[in-house]
C-alpha cells in the first residue's frame, strides 16, 4: 500500500521539493482534517504558510466565531486560514509571523515577530507575540501583551463597547487597539478617515485603510 505523504505547513511542503507558489493541502500530525492553504515559496527563502490575505475586497470578513475558527474565503485570493488550525500548529513548534502590508501609493512594509502562537479556543485564541522587527513601525500594532480574539458574535475585547461590531471583522482587539487587518475593505480614494478599515496604526496612522495585507508563518528553525 502506498504511503500517503502529508504536510503540516508550507515549510514541510518546500523541503519536500515543492518550491512553486500555490495552494497546497495541509494536515496536522495525528489528524485527518485537511485544510487548503496558500504557500509562498519565493519570499524571504520560501516555506511561508499564508494565514490571512486581503487584496481586493472580494470576501466578507465580518464573520462569526465559528467561521474564523475553521477558516473562510479562497486560498488563492482573500482568506482566513482558521484559528483552530493555526493554534494547533503554532503550539507544536516555534513559529515566526510576518505581516506584509501595501498602501495605495505603491509603498510596502512588513512587521516580523520572532515568536508567534495562538492559545487554544478555551482561551479565545489569545495571541502571543515576541521580538518585533521590520519597517511597518517600531511599536507593535498588535497590542502587547496579546488579547483574546473577538468576532461579531464573541465580544472578548477590553472595551465596554463591542469592537468587532463597531470596527467590523474578527481580530485581537484591545479597546479597540492600533490594528485590524480584517476590517472593511475600502477602494482607492475612499480609504482615508475610515475608523473601520484595514488598519495598521504604527505604519499609516488611524484613519488609513490599506490596499493589501498578508499574514504568513514559518517555523523559526526553517
Amino acid at each position: 500500500k502506498e504511503e500517503q505523504i502529508s504536510f503540516r505547513d508550507c515549510a514541510e511542503v518546500f523541503k519536500s521539493g515543492h518550491t512553486t507558489n500555490g495552494v497546497y493541502t495541509l494536515t496536522l500530525p495525528n489528524s485527518t482534517e485537511e485544510v487548503k492553504a496558500y504557500c509562498d515559496m519565493e519570499a524571504g527563502g520560501g516555506g511561508w504558510t499564508i494565514i490571512q490575505r486581503r487584496e481586493d475586497g472580494s470576501v466578507d470578513f465580518q464573520r462569526t466565531w465559528k467561521e474564523y475558527k475553521v477558516g473562510f474565503g479562497n486560498p488563492s485570493g482573500e482568506y482566513w486560514l482558521g484559528n483552530e488550525f493555526v493554534s494547533q500548529l503554532t503550539n507544536q513548534q516555534r513559529y515566526v509571523l510576518k505581516i506584509h502590508l501595501k498602501d495605495w501609493e505603491g509603498n510596502e512594509a512588513y512587521s516580523l515577530y520572532e515568536h508567534f502562537y495562538l492559545s487554544s479556543e478555551e482561551l479565545n485564541y489569545r495571541i502571543h507575540l515576541k521580538g518585533l522587527t521590520g519597517t511597518a513601525g517600531k511599536i507593535s500594532s498588535i497590542s502587547q501583551p496579546g488579547n483574546d480574539f473577538s468576532t461579531k458574535d464573541a465580544d472578548n475585547d477590553k472595551c465596554i463597547c463591542k469592537c468587532s461590531q463597531m470596527l467590523t471583522g474578527g481580530w485581537w482587539f484591545d479597546a479597540c487597539g492600533p490594528s485590524n487587518l480584517n476590517g472593511m475593505y475600502y477602494p482607492q480614494r475612499q480609504n482615508t478617515n475610515k475608523f473601520n478599515g484595514i488598519k495598521w496604526y504604527y505604519w499609516k496612522g488611524s484613519g488609513y485603510s490599506l490596499k493589501g495585507t498578508t499574514m504568513m508563518i514559518r517555523p523559526a528553525d526553517f
Epitope: 478555551e122 482561551l123 479565545n124 483574546d148 458574535d153 464573541a154
Partner: nanobody, 120 residues
C-alpha cells in the same frame, strides 16, 4: 463547568462603600483562573444588563464603564481564584444585582449574582 460565586452585596446608604468578591472554580484540566479575562456586570430592575468593568488575566489591564469610572476598582487575586469590585461613593443608581462573568471558547459562564441596594 466553571462555577462563579459572588458575595459582599448588601444595603448601604449613598456615599458608602462595598467590596464584592467573585470566587471561581471548576476550570478545565490544564487551565487556571489566571488564564482568564474576567468581567463584572450589573442588572437593575427593568433595565438591560450593563458591563461595569473588565480585568485582564494578569490583572494589569482594567477597563471601566463611564458611569463608575473613578468610583469603582476591579482587581483580582490569582492565587485565591478571586476577583473583586471595590465600590466607593455609591449612588442610588448603582442599585442592581452584580454578576461576575468569564468568557471561554465563545460561551459565557455566569454567577448567580449579589444584590447591592443603595438607599437612604
Amino acid at each position: 463547568e466553571v462555577q462563579l460565586v459572588e458575595s459582599g452585596g448588601g444595603l448601604v446608604q449613598p456615599g458608602e462603600s462595598l467590596r464584592l468578591s467573585c470566587v471561581a472554580s471548576g476550570f478545565p484540566s490544564g487551565f487556571t483562573f489566571s488564564d482568564y479575562q474576567m468581567y463584572w456586570y450589573r442588572q437593575a430592575p427593568g433595565k438591560e444588563r450593563e458591563l461595569v468593568a473588565i480585568i485582564s488575566n494578569d490583572g494589569l489591564r482594567k477597563t471601566y464603564a463611564d458611569s463608575v469610572k473613578g468610583r469603582f476598582t476591579i482587581s483580582r487575586d490569582n492565587a485565591k481564584n478571586t476577583m473583586f469590585l471595590q465600590m466607593n461613593s455609591l449612588k442610588p443608581e448603582d442599585t442592581a444585582v452584580y454578576v461576575c462573568n468569564v468568557r471561554r471558547a465563545n460561551r459565557d459562564d455566569w454567577g448567580q449574582g449579589t444584590q447591592v441596594t443603595v438607599s437612604s
